[in-house]
């Protein structure tokens, strides 16, 4: 399976929610004996390998925002912890998953990356990821609301095997 | 439907005042981001100011050649923006419209007003 | 301030005739936005974010471009396009193309 980022670049004003998108393509095994974790982190850019140095978002980690289930099923984070930083994410049942970040500032402006391992019991496991940037704008030069930048088609599939 | 009504606009001689308005409906007014746009033969199209949502503080920016002789302004209430301008010139003659921003760009533009500057 | 450069500044096609607008910039632009102006109208948005066909328009219209070198193409033009064309770009300063105007032959 790979990881799909619809847009590689989110511009957005000061103040203003965003939902950051991955999506999960390929087939997908739904056995007993297969799950997926899902999670998003902070990366820096100027790497050997995008995504391989894993920050927090917003002082949450990768474990606090993750997402654990089997196949294609719908899944929240834990509600409280990441709401009281304004920040949820998501997953359906379409293999879509998300962050949204509320109340942006210029801080939350950097790299963000989704992360998906599907893990097989007594397995080996399979990991992909996704990188998106995200720019916060103040002053005259910020939209008015997010715009968001397609990613082209050979950036939009991340495949990073583990 | 969006509507963007423009009206004020007038013949005033040089360095005389007007308040240009400007009527809004179908939209969420008060997370709008609103401007003027004006246009003449000698100029073209000019970004002329910008008044932004409550959520942004109502900040205001202004093109340099128009700082400190026009003032924009909002009432929410109203789902009206103004254009208090000021010291008038020749060269602000033109047409003034009334646009809404989305992103980047002017979505929705109203029919504009004419002001001339002439003695 | 960023200068975006129209051409041609008028242009004279057939019906049915393909055609492509260009808008030049001074330094580099991300996007690029195009409006359709009728005479004694208002300008109407056609193409924003370089690519996106605004609601309403017909899709023989259509934007591409990057850096600094953006076009707007009509596949196959009607009478009803004759209008002036401008690009616009909103860096840290907004700022228009001085226009083409299109009439059609």
């Known amino acids: 399976f790979k990881v799909a980022t619809p847009y590689s670049l989110y511009v957005c004003p000061e103040g203003q929610n965003v939902t950051l998108t991955c999506r999960l393509l390929g087939p997908v095994d739904k056995g007993h004996d297969v799950t997926f974790y899902k999670t998003w982190y902070r990366s820096s850019r100027g790497e050997v390998q995008t995504c391989s140095e894993r920050r927090p978002i917003r002082n949450l980690t990768f474990q606090d925002l993750h997402l654990h289930h089997g196949g294609h099923q719908a899944a929240n984070t834990s509600h409280d912890l990441a709401q009281r930083h304004g920040l949820e994410s998501a997953s359906d049942h379409h293999g879509n998953f998300s962050i949204t970040m509320r109340n942006l500032t210029l801080l939350d402006s950097g790299l963000y990356c989704c992360l998906v391992v599907e893990i097989r019991h007594h397995h080996s496991e399979h990991r992909v990821h996704g990188a998106m940037e995200l720019q916060v704008q103040t002053g005259k030069d910020a939209p008015s609301n997010c715009v968001v930048y397609p990613s082209s088609s050979q950036d939009s599939e991340n495949i990073t095997a583990a | 439907e969006v509507k963007v009504e423009e009206s004020g606009g007038g013949l005033v001689q040089p360095g005389g005042s007007m308040k240009l308005s400007c009527a809004a409906s179908?939209?969420?007014?008060?997370?709008?981001?609103m401007d003027w746009v004006h246009q003449s033969p000698e100029k073209g199209l000019e970004w002329v100011a910008e008044i932004r949502s409550k959520a942004n503080n109502h900040a205001t920016y202004y093109v340099e050649s128009v700082e400190g002789r026009f003032t924009i302004s909002r009432d929410d209430s109203k789902s009206s923006v103004f254009l208090q301008v000021n010291s008038l010139r020749p060269e602000d003659t033109g047409i003034y419209y009334c646009?809404?921003?989305?992103?980047?760009?002017?979505?929705?533009w109203g029919q504009g007003t004419l002001v001339t500057v002439s003695a | 301030d960023i200068v975006l450069t129209q051409s041609p500044a008028i242009m004279s096609a057939s019906l049915g005739e393909e055609i492509t607008l260009t808008c030049s910039a001074s330094?580099?632009?991300?996007?690029m936005h195009w409006y359709q102006q009728k005479s004694g109208t208002s300008p109407k948005v056609l193409i924003y974010?370089?690519?996106n066909l605004a609601s309403g328009v017909p899709s023989r219209f259509s934007g591409s471009g990057s850096g600094t070198f953006y076009s707007l193409t009509i596949s196959s033009v009607e009478a009803g396009d004759a209008a002036a064309y401008y690009c616009h770009q909103w860096s840290s300063y907004p700022t228009f193309g001085g226009g083409t105007k299109l009439e059609i032959k």
């Open positions: 646009t809404r921003r989305d992103g980047y760009y002017f979505a929705y």
């Open positions: 330094s580099s632009v991300r996007d």
């Open positions: 179908g939209f969420t007014f008060s997370d709008a981001w």
């Open positions: 974010n370089t690519f």
